[in-house]
């Protein structure tokens, strides 16, 4: 892409952060080997990536979690990549589901989501999971990002 | 991207190769339906992708493996995408973990890693796994690549 | 990428669709929050993405499925990203394999495939699975796309 001032690169990669909040929305931080190309993409409230320019973006998330079938609800672990555009309802862009492991005390699994989507100026994307307490925050295990085409 | 001579496309996609080496670093080859856009990215020693230009890269790896819980250590199978920059220590960019399957003789699982990272000239990226003997080298199962934004 | 008329963005993201066909090739639709940048990439017969311009493309697919080890064949669930170029045989670009879950009635798992490949004008890519009846078509679970570098 290597673009001029009129057309700068826009990309972000943020790192998961454990949170005491009881929300299902994952929390992220600009820490470790993170990427934030410029102010045309920002991390807001530690929970969503917000873009200033309209266009096509490749958006991705990776979530590693540790769960046990007996200790979890019957429903699988689901990670959802969601979109909130100004003046619109939230919508799901991508989801992945993994049934809990039978391993004791818990079995680790990794989920990867990614796709190309049109974003409007001011649009935000975020990641929801069924149980944030099961998410692994060790180096490199859980991350979230985007790049503008 | 479709760039001029000043700003050529830089991309690579290499294919896994079985190796007699006892190292945990996976081996790759320019074989099958591989991609190597030009000499601004190279595969060195069959183990790492090295870039000549600084910039933002989307880097990815996919690893398919076959393992059994009883025959493996208690630790899960972990695939790590690692970075070695000139004059710096190695660091982990991304990791994924999957608990071993209870299927006999082994259960296959696939891991996908991907993210956007800033690379310096001469930086190399490589893939580490906990047990290379479990990795699947059948057509398309295990691969590694990058593209410059 | 943000390109001029000579060099427009080319990208697609299509959504899985349940099908009564007995073929192992997954079916897709331009529905929901899909992307189809222009007529330089098209969805043909609901099954393949076809490009008009030669070049390097990042191609990806995500498949979520629900299966049970006892009710399935011994072979794992395999998702394959395949290429059909004009005048050439089909070939496998990427594959992922997941052993069926022991969960009852079935255990959900998600597979993600992605890589950079050179496509010729008129080339088509499609996704094959071992058992289409096991694929999850709920919002966001199964999708397929590409972007031109």
């Amino acid at each position: 892409m290597q673009k001029g001032d009129q057309n700068p690169q826009i990309a972000a990669h943020v790192i998961s952060e454990a949170s005491s909040k009881t929300t299902s929305v994952l929390q992220w931080a600009e820490k470790g080997y993170y990427t934030m190309s410029n102010n045309l993409v920002t991390l807001e409230n530690g929970k969503q990536l917000t873009v200033k320019r309209q266009g096509l973006y490749y958006i991705y998330a990776q979530v590693t979690f540790c769960s046990n079938r007996e200790a979890s609800s019957q429903a699988p672990f689901i990670a959802s990549l969601c979109l909130k555009s100004p003046g619109r309802f939230e919508r799901i862009l991508l989801r992945a589901a993994n049934t809990h492991s039978s391993a004791k005390p818990c079995g680790q699994q990794s989920i990867h989501l990614g796709g190309v989507f049109e974003l409007q100026p001011g649009a935000s994307v975020f990641v929801n999971v069924t149980d944030p307490s099961q998410v692994s925050h060790g180096t490199g295990f859980t991350s979230f990002g985007l790049l503008k085409l | 991207m479709q760039k001029g001579d000043q700003n050529p496309q830089i991309a690579a996609h290499v294919i896994s190769e079985a190796s007699s080496k006892t190292t945990s670093v996976l081996q790759w080859a320019e074989k099958g339906y591989y991609t190597m856009s030009n000499n601004l990215v190279t595969l060195e020693n069959g183990k790492q992708l090295t870039v000549k230009r600084q910039g933002l890269y989307y880097i990815y790896a996919q690893v398919t493996f076959c393992s059994n819980r009883e025959a493996s250590s208690q630790a899960p199978f972990i695939a790590s995408l690692c970075l070695k920059s000139p004059g710096r220590f190695e660091r982990i960019l991304l990791r994924a973990a999957n608990t071993h399957s209870s299927a006999k003789p082994c259960g296959q699982q696939s891991i996908h890693l991907g993210g956007v990272f800033e690379l310096q000239p001469g930086a190399s990226v490589f893939v580490n796994v906990t047990d290379p003997s479990q990795v699947s080298h059948g057509t398309g199962f295990t691969s590694f690549g990058l593209l410059k934004l | 990428m943000q390109k001029g008329d000579q060099n427009p963005q080319i990208a697609a993201h299509v959504i899985s669709e349940a099908s009564s066909k007995t073929t192992s090739v997954l079916q897709w639709a331009e529905k929901g929050y899909y992307t189809m940048s222009n007529n330089l990439v098209t969805l043909e017969n609901g099954k393949q993405l076809t490009v008009k311009r030669q070049g390097l493309y990042y191609i990806y697919a995500q498949v979520t499925f629900c299966s049970n080890r006892e009710a399935s064949s011994q072979a794992p669930f395999i998702a394959s990203l395949c290429l059909k170029s004009p005048g050439r045989f089909e070939r496998i670009l990427l594959r992922a394999a997941n052993t069926h879950s022991s969960a009852k009635p079935c255990g959900q798992q998600s597979i993600h495939l992605g890589g950079v490949f050179e496509l010729q004008p008129g080339a088509s890519v499609f996704v094959n699975v071992t058992d289409p009846s096991q694929v999850s078509h709920g919002t966001g679970f199964t999708s397929f796309g590409l972007l031109k570098l």
């Epitope: - | 079985a18 009883e70 025959a71 003997s133 990795v135 | -």
Partner: nanobody
């Protein structure tokens, strides 16, 4: 290309013994396991036993205590010692191995247990 060749099958009386061998040939870089499956007429292929590269061995309940798996890593060969054979052990026995990052199968050897 790596190949697996089984030998040692044949006709044996109930209560008798046989020793099957599975030899891997070709350039072998890595081995995760070698093992045995069997398929009786009209039935699905079933797993019997596996020996892993770390020496761990596992058996299906139907053969536990009667069959013993072993491996000679220097020869890339696995063995299945079958004792106290029963008519229901009659099947084609297949060697299977995870070699060089792929699941390999032999052609099979027929074991018939009959008086």
């Amino acid at each position: 290309e790596v190949q697996l060749v089984e030998s040692g099958g044949g006709l044996v009386q109930p209560g008798g013994s046989l020793r099957l061998s599975c030899a891997a040939s070709g350039r072998i870089f890595s081995t995760y396991f070698m093992g045995w499956f069997r398929q009786a007429p009209g039935k699905e292929r079933e797993w019997i036993s596996t020996v892993y590269s770390n020496g761990h061995t596992y058996y299906a309940d139907s053969v536990k205590g009667r069959f013993t798996i072993s491996a000679d890593n220097s020869k890339n060969t696995a063995y299945l010692q079958m004792n106290s054979l029963k008519p229901e052990d009659t099947a084609v026995y297949y060697c299977a191995a995870w070699l060089n990052g792929g699941n390999r199968w032999g052609q099979g050897t027929l074991v018939t247990v009959s008086s």
